[in-house]
């Protein structure tokens, strides 16, 4: 029994790793601005983008880069429980705190923020730099998509890396991870194509999530084939002239729920890592 | 001056480090093992293509990732003259051979095997579980493009780690690096949208050359609507049935010149980043 | 020629359910979008939903999602309509009809009458 | 959901003039479609992204309109141009038709 709360404790954790962010701004600095000048450099590359084939192609190709970047930057998550392993294991053994008030304390104060701002300046710098999508629950759907993304694959770093004493394993196994979850994301393949005992590895895929809910948002209801002019019975049944048509051939369910879906699956996986992250430090404590 | 030859220096140079790679086998066969592995992986993910839509979508994701997997695996390179460093500054100093007949032994007998094995497995798993184009030529140009594309991204990689103490930082460059180059390949974003001021950055980018003639390779004489006797003028602008509408969308030159210019611009390539990383190491003897 | 051939007139009971058949032929079916439509007497259009034979994507007007159920038969070039829990409001003329796309409707099929009566 | 309402419900009208049917949209679309049904038959496609016409279909139709608002106009009425027409829309995945006009002979 401790003679403090949870809410202390948790209170006492957080306000100690926030002074130790804040006490050393380097490193979030240099994100930030890392974060800004690559946000600035897409905004750049696909300035103003058309409404015709290279729109399709430069919209999935944009989204893509963000979810695969989201998903890669969160690598670096694999740190948050590994440096301070024995700082924790001295701290709990000494009565400290629990495990809970540890863990919730290092993901409000530390994952929540070094996670959510990424989210808000790419999406602030590139949504109308790109001109996509000109309605503001567009806007915010994709902001929330690529923080669920940042926090679900920074779930599964803390999954992997809680408890562990070197981070360079933990990084090369996330890594590894990530690119089988690229292939899988559903711009390097056609996810309707994919052999039916294969096809099942993508619902395991964090960046295919974020990917399809950003598709689904930005491509419902535009067009890609301005002032089209043509024959009836001709190639142009091969064209993708709207992006309900682009969807459908990427095997995107086009309802509301096509949408959130991938947000529910996000959550899910986020818990569920979140719970093996929680698990493992607990265990670690029992073998300290 | 050295009483042995450049000759003789080179070959005592290569025989060494070749002995050093068959006295410690698991790395090498660790590599051949990943490499037949992912590349079963990548058969099976995209298993007989299609000649529709998808096989577009398809052709042109398994094409990137074979280039920009080229690419990040070439970073390990860096070690090639970073772990010997010491080493070598100490033989050379004591006039064991000359900075060429290291350079060019090294080269010989880690860098050229070990960069051309991943190149020969993936096209020869690949090339026929996918069903890409069925001729010889097609096949041993794809087997050449990825080998020069091992090649130039193993020589940037020494250009950028040449006469470095640790690996780390010449790591975390390449793969900054790598990430731009792999924006500006041809699949994230339309090559032919960039702004001008912007575009001229394409021509640095070695996984542009690589996809490039991979997908010049592929698509040329390729039909993507079936049922339908396309001709190469179609009469609908926003479809593309056929592998020259394709490659005209993506700003691809259909002449021979348009396949052969990627691999003299790759061989350039590794003129210079060879020339530069033999630059460094004889400078680097000049501050020991 | 392109055709569209349906299945025959179909009188049901309420409560009951009903699948109609729509046959395709001179094209290539998995590369067309095939619709369903109906037509009460004197009402408009209404559209039920469509599904894409290449890859059996399906989407469904909301009136009708839970009743009516979009198949496909890739190998016998034959798309299928079924709606359950049938009313005597859903006395009508069933059509299918192939998209270009999700652009337009360039072929029709001569359509079915599906009578619900007790 | 989007809703088109078609204007005039029945037109009556002799042969050899002018006929005018309006389409209009509750919100912006990027082109409509128009189909032609007779009694006892399918309906069939007239008119297709909003100005271009479909195979068979006489030059005396013609399509017009952006936005909200469209036309179906007939330059002179012939008499196996009396039949119901229907303008349609897609947008966010799903078709709407208009309520119809009937064009009949005065």
């Known amino acids: 029994s401790y003679t403090t709360s949870f809410c202390h404790q948790l209170r006492w954790v957080s306000k100690r790793s926030f002074k130790n962010l804040l006490g050393n701004p380097q490193a979030s600095i240099a994100q930030i601005i890392v974060t800004v000048i690559l946000g600035l450099v897409i905004g750049a590359i696909y300035f103003g983008l058309n409404n015709d084939s290279t729109g399709i192609q430069n919209r999935a190709g944009v989204l893509f880069f963000l979810t695969t970047n989201q998903c890669f930057s969160s690598v670096s998550a694999v740190e948050l429980f590994v440096v301070e392993k024995k700082l924790f294991i001295h701290e709990y053994i000494s009565g400290y705190y629990r495990v809970s008030s540890y863990f919730f304390g290092k993901l409000l104060s530390d994952l929540l923020p070094m996670r959510m701002l990424p989210s808000i300046i790419f999406t602030c710098i590139v949504y109308f730099m790109l001109g996509l999508k000109p309605t503001a629950d567009a806007f915010f759907i994709m902001m929330f998509t690529l923080m669920m993304v940042a926090y679900s694959a920074s779930s599964m770093a803390l999954a992997i890396a809680a408890g562990q004493s070197v981070v360079s394993v933990a990084t090369l196994l996330m890594t590894i991870c990530f690119v089988f979850m690229m292939i899988f994301s559903g711009l390097l393949v056609n996810l309707t194509t994919i052999a039916s005992w294969l096809s099942w590895l993508q619902y395991f895929s964090i960046p295919r999530y974020g990917f399809t809910a950003l598709q689904h948002n930005e491509f419902l209801g535009q067009n890609f084939c301005p002032g089209l002019n043509a024959t009836v019975n001709n190639t142009c049944n091969y064209a993708t002239c709207t992006g309900e048509e682009y969807l459908t051939k990427q095997g995107i369910d086009l309802s509301p729920w096509g949408l959130w879906k991938n947000h529910v699956a996000l959550a899910c996986m986020i818990v569920i890592f979140l719970t093996i992250a929680y698990l493992k430090l607990l265990f670690l404590k029992k073998y300290s | 001056s050295y009483t042995t030859s450049f000759c003789h220096q080179l070959r005592w140079v290569s025989k060494r480090s070749f002995k050093n790679l068959l006295g410690n086998p698991q790395a090498s066969i660790a590599q051949i093992i990943v490499t037949v592995i992912l590349g079963l992986v990548i058969g099976a993910i995209y298993f007989g293509l299609n000649n529709d839509s998808t096989g577009i979508q398809n052709r042109a994701g398994v094409l990137f990732f074979l280039t920009t997997n080229q690419c990040f695996s070439s970073v390990s390179a860096v070690e090639l003259f970073v772990v010997e460093k010491k080493l070598f500054i100490h033989e050379y100093i004591s006039g064991y051979y000359r900075v060429s007949s290291y350079f060019f032994g090294k080269l010989l007998s880690d860098l050229l095997p070990m960069r051309m094995l991943p190149s020969i497995i993936f096209t020869c798993i690949v090339y026929f579980m996918l069903g890409l184009k069925p001729t010889a030529d097609a096949f041993f140009i794809m087997m050449f493009t990825l080998m020069m594309v091992a090649y130039s991204a193993s020589s940037m990689a020494l250009a950028i780690a040449a006469g470095q103490s640790v690996v780390s930082v010449a790591t975390l460059l390449m793969t900054i690096c790598f990430v731009f180059m792999m924006i500006f390949s041809g699949l994230l974003v339309n090559l032919t949208t960039i702004a001008s001021w912007l575009s001229w950055l394409q021509y640095f980018s070695i996984p542009r050359y690589g996809f490039t003639a991979l997908q010049h390779n592929e698509f040329l004489g390729q039909n993507f609507c079936p049922g339908l006797n396309a001709t190469v003028n179609n009469t609908c602008n926003y479809a593309t049935c056929t592998g020259e509408e394709y490659l005209t969308k993506q700003g691809i030159d259909l002449s021979p010149w348009g396949l052969w210019k990627n691999h003299v611009a790759l061989a350039c390539m590794i003129v210079i980043f060879l020339t530069i990383a033999y630059l460094k190491l004889l400078f680097l003897k000049k501050y020991s | 020629e392109i055709q569209l051939v349906q299945s025959g007139a179909e009188v049901k009971k309420p409560g009951a359910s009903v699948k109609v058949s729509c046959k395709a032929s001179g094209y290539t079916f998995t590369d067309y979008y095939i619709n369903w439509v109906r037509q009460a007497p004197g009402q408009r259009l209404e559209w039920i939903g469509w599904i894409y034979p290449g890859n059996v994507n399906v989407k469904y007007n909301e009136k009708f999602k839970g009743r009516a159920t979009l198949t496909v038969d890739t190998s016998a070039s034959t798309g299928y309509m079924e709606l359950s829990s049938l009313r005597s409001e859903d006395t009508a003329v069933y059509f299918c009809a192939r998209s270009i796309g999700l652009r337009y409707f360039d072929n029709w099929g001569q359509g079915t009458l599906v009578t619900v009566s007790s | 959901e989007k809703v088109l309402t078609q204007s005039p419900a029945t037109l009556s009208l002799s042969p050899g003039e002018r006929a005018t049917l309006s389409c209009r949209a509750s919100s912006s679309v990027h082109y409509m479609y128009w189909h032609q049904q007779k009694p006892g038959q399918s309906p069939r496609l007239w008119i297709y992204?909003?100005?271009n016409l479909a195979p068979g279909v006489p030059a005396r139709f013609s399509g017009s309109g952006s936005g909200n608002d469209y036309t179906l106009t007939i330059s002179s009425l012939e008499p196996e141009d009396f039949a119901v027409y229907y303008c349609?829309?897609?947008?966010?995945?799903?078709?709407?038709f208009g309520g119809g006009t009937k064009l009949e002979i005065k």
């Open positions: 349609q829309q897609f947008t966010t995945s799903t078709w709407t």
């Open positions: 992204y909003t100005s």
